[in-house]
């Protein structure tokens, strides 16, 4: 039951995270005009990965797409790539994890296959989250660098000194959405990897054989007392009278290749 819950929760958290990564990638507010020097501006600028926008005090908003590829900064292209890779990996991870969910029965899929798929999707979510966090962090670093470079300058115009304040940009809402979403996807991926361990198939147990000794009606099951392995094994010496049948909660997991990721 705990495995199913962990897997389900991991899926839901990753789903929310990937939805957030998609939202952040599409958002226009990656960088917003710094209003420190002019808090009552009548023209507000903000920029996204795909277009830049201007919102006027009148309420009129105009957005212009970046219709060039070669003319864009390499860093922006890198951020775009990281976010897209994150989305693609996350989407594939979601698709894989749907089939890996323990609560969903698909034909005669074995637990080992579900465990593999859970691990695969978990790794994909982790990489997806890392891509999003990396992309947002690169963009944030770019903003910080540009912010300090964009200081007000003075130049001499006709008729004396005329001041021009270069527009400075600071962190936009999309950055925070991206960081949180990337973190959620990462957490979801870790949860899927943890759930994978619980899904790993058990060692085959011998079929229980009942020996009816005279005067005693106790079933004897070879292998009924499993040696403690330290990986979720049942340490209580519990005699089993059910001939090997168990509930999902009692299923014990053993070390497998999936535990060492």
């Amino acid at each position: 039951m705990a495995v199913t819950a962990c897997q389900g929760l991991g899926f839901v958290v990753s789903l929310i995270g990937i939805a957030g990564i998609i939202a952040a990638t599409c958002m226009d507010q990656w960088s917003t005009q710094d209003l420190y020097n002019n808090p009552v501006t009548a023209v507000f600028n903000y920029q996204g990965l795909w277009r830049s926008c201007v919102r006027e005090s009148s309420g009129f908003t105009e957005c212009r797409g970046y219709f060039t590829l070669l003319g864009l900064p390499a860093m922006l292209q890198a951020v775009r790539a990281l976010m897209i890779v994150g989305i693609v990996l996350g989407a594939i991870g979601l698709l894989v994890s749907i089939f890996a969910l323990k609560c969903i029965r698909i034909g005669s899929m074995e637990d080992s296959a579900k465990a593999n798929m859970t691990l695969t999707s978990g790794i994909m979510f982790i990489v997806s989250g890392l891509c999003a966090i990396a992309g947002v962090s690169v963009f944030a670093n770019m903003l910080v660098t540009n912010f300090w470079m964009s200081t007000a300058n003075m130049y001499t115009g006709m008729g004396g000194m005329v001041q021009t304040v270069q527009t400075r940009y600071t962190f936009g809402a999309a950055l925070f959405v991206g960081w949180v979403a990337g973190g959620l996807t990462l957490i979801g991926g870790v949860m899927m990897c943890i759930a994978c361990r619980g899904l790993a198939p058990e060692e085959t147990n011998y079929k229980a054989v009942s020996y009816h000794a005279s005067g005693h009606s106790v079933a004897y099951k070879p292998g009924g007392f499993k040696a403690s392995t330290g990986f979720g094994s049942n340490t209580k010496n519990k005699k089993i009278y059910d001939g090997g049948a168990r509930t999902e909660d009692e299923v014990q997991s053993y070390p497998s290749k999936h535990d060492y990721v």
Epitope: V54, E56, V165
Partner: antibody, heavy 118, light 113 residues
């Protein structure tokens, strides 16, 4: 047809109060940022205050800050300017205006005259 | 605050003549986000409210005759009337629409000789 009709002007003593109204019609009032602009007799134009659509952010000229309050009632399609602690230099024709692209004022009312005199 | 200075204060021209009036701002009105200049020109005829002529420094408002044109960028702007008509007698104001407080120039009075 877009129409802006100001009312509420008149003669008031220094230190007195007055409330100007601007009835708007012919457009979706709630979607537009609105402003008040004044013009003293024989003088140039002076921006007074602006109120945005939606969240209703307000902006004021330094000369009226703390004394004038711009507000709007979208249900009544009406813009207001509450003027307190009036001074002689507030004597002017007050125009109600609508903002459009470029923050330009594309429609103006006919104006209402406010005279502050003892 | 951005100070708007218009020149000349007044000018008298003959009908059909080309006229230019200037407006200078103390700070640049060019917005880097959309590369537009937030300067507006208004015409005010005697006894009437002002009328919008040009916004974004060079975009003519609908219904405004094409003899009116705006130009300039940054801090220096010009309003040109290619062929003055009798009905163009008015005071012309430029306005900063870039940052609050919105400020107007003192106006340029156009008269016919």
């Amino acid at each position: 047809e877009v129409q802006l009709l100001e009312s509420g002007g008149g003669l008031v003593q220094p230190g007195g109060s007055l409330r100007l109204s601007c009835a708007a019609s012919g457009f979706t009032f709630s979607s537009y940022t609105m402003s008040w602009v004044r013009q003293a007799p024989g003088k140039g134009l002076e921006w007074v205050a602006t109120i945005s659509s939606g969240v209703s952010y307000t902006y004021y000229a330094d000369s009226v800050k703390g004394r004038f309050t711009i507000s709007r009632d979208n249900s009544k399609n009406t813009l207001y300017l509450q003027m307190n602690s009036l001074r002689a230099e507030d004597t002017a024709v007050y125009y109600c205006t609508r903002l459009t692209k470029g923050n330009a004022m594309d429609y103006w009312g006919q104006g209402t005259l406010v005279t502050v005199s003892s | 605050d951005i100070v708007m200075t218009q020149s000349p204060d007044s000018l008298a021209v003959s009908l059909g003549e080309r006229v230019t009036m200037n407006c200078k701002s103390s700070q640049s009105l060019l917005n880097s986000g959309n590369q537009k200049n937030y300067l507006t020109w208004y015409q005010q005829k005697p006894g009437q409210p002002p009328k919008l002529l040009i916004y974004w420094a060079s975009t003519r408002e609908s219904g405004v005759p094409d003899r009116f044109s705006g130009s300039g960028s940054g801090t220096d702007f010009t309003l040109t009337i290619s062929s003055v008509q009798a009905e163009d007698v008015a005071v012309y104001y430029c306005q900063n629409d870039y940052s609050y407080p919105f400020t107007f120039g003192q106006g340029t009075k156009l008269e016919i000789k």
